[in-house]
Interface confidence: low
């Protein structure tokens, strides 16, 4: 069973510290050839992917991955007992929710099992590598003739996460866009009775609970309002 | 089924310190995260500070960060909030809160009411 594990681009405070761990050689051998770099994303908390692209290597390789927690209880040398493979060979390393500690350094060793001297060795603070599932249940009230109250709700620790809401009517080319704190809600103090509006909300991992940059996926839709896209001049480009 | 239990409410001048204690029930926490919340009448409950079972993963809100610092006894049975230089305004109940993972808060006590006068 061959799996494709998508995750997002970028990963910019993953690497505390990098380092190729070598051994010196009389000529250029396998082991001078640096290995990929390990990229970990821990969703919702829930599980943890750490990836590298494995079409970078020479040759098919399967790479073997060690992990641990540096000073602390957990310091033990794990071997990854979940692999993900690309075209058959280790492209990744899925842990589990046991797994995952996220205020303690987070070690990871990439190891190239025919040339032990090749290795390569990754610090990670977890906590600002979580990827929070998409807001759900997104709810609108409407507070009086013209304001908008927009709900969500989040499946994590609320005072953990911020959001970013995007709004835009029919007749508009661009979003809006407004954060909000963990208190998920927003309101619209003036709402056009006459045009349909969408809203879609995304979160992340910060700055409560952790200082992470990737953004949650964007919730499902949901729309408000007259639908008065026959007369909407915009309507194509918007769909296009 | 984590009991949670509040104790070290009470009435304080404003510039005063109290210390808020929270246990799990005579037992160890099993939960991955300890939380402390507040509401003031009338107002949403709002989130105060949190602290993780290793006890380096440490939050606070702006309003009481310098001021409120929280802290679990190494047995990870008790946590506590130490609050110095109270204002009137940090007059609320508060309640802990404890969650199994991070998807939510499980387990929370009855609250303890903090009354800051002037």
């Known amino acids: 069973l061959n799996t494709t594990i998508l995750t997002p681009n970028g990963n910019e405070d993953t690497t505390a510290d990098f380092f190729l761990t070598t051994m010196p050689t009389d000529s250029l051998s396998v082991s001078t050839l640096p290995l990929p770099e390990v990229q970990c994303f821990v969703f919702n908390v829930e599980y943890m992917n750490c990836t590298w692209n494995s079409s970078s290597e020479p040759q098919p390789t399967n790479l073997t991955l060690h992990y641990w927690y540096k000073n602390s209880d957990n310091d033990k040398v794990q071997k990854c007992s979940h692999y993900l493979f690309s075209e058959e060979i280790t492209s990744g390393c899925q842990l589990q929710k046991k797994e995952i500690h996220l205020y303690q350094t987070f070690v990871v060793q990439l190891q190239d099992p025919r040339e032990p001297r090749r290795q390569a060795t990754q610090m990670l603070k977890l906590q600002n590598l979580v990827i929070p599932w998409a807001p759900e249940n997104l709810t609108l009230h409407k507070l009086s003739e013209s304001q908008l109250e927009l709900n969500w709700n989040n499946r994590f620790l609320n005072h953990c996460l911020e959001h970013l809401v995007q709004y835009r009517t029919d007749w508009d080319h661009s979003w809006t866009e407004q954060s909000v704190d963990y208190r998920h809600k927003f309101s619209l103090p003036s709402v056009d009775g006459q045009k349909r509006y969408t809203f879609r909300v995304r979160s992340r991992f910060n700055p409560l609970c952790g200082s992470a940059q990737h953004w949650s996926e964007w919730s499902h839709p949901i729309h408000w309002g007259s639908n008065t896209s026959k007369e909407n001049p915009f309507l194509f480009a918007l769909e296009a | 089924q984590v009991q949670l239990v509040e104790s070290g409410g009470g009435l304080v001048q404003a510039g005063g310190s109290l210390t808020l204690s929270c246990a799990a029930s005579g037992r160890t926490f099993s939960t991955d995260v300890v939380g402390w919340f507040r509401q003031a009448p009338g107002k949403e409950r709002e989130f105060v500070a949190s602290?993780?079972?290793?006890?380096?993963?440490?939050y606070y809100d702006d309003s009481v960060k310098g001021r409120f610092t929280i802290s679990r006894n190494n047995a990870w049975n008790t946590v506590n909030l130490q609050m110095n230089n109270l204002k009137v305004e940090d007059t609320a109940v508060y309640y802990c809160?404890?969650?199994?993972?991070?998807?939510?808060?499980?387990?929370w006590g009855q609250g303890t009411q903090v009354t800051v006068s002037s």
């Open positions: 809160a404890a969650g199994d993972g991070w998807s939510t808060y499980d387990y």
């Open positions: 602290i993780s079972r290793s006890g380096d993963g440490i």
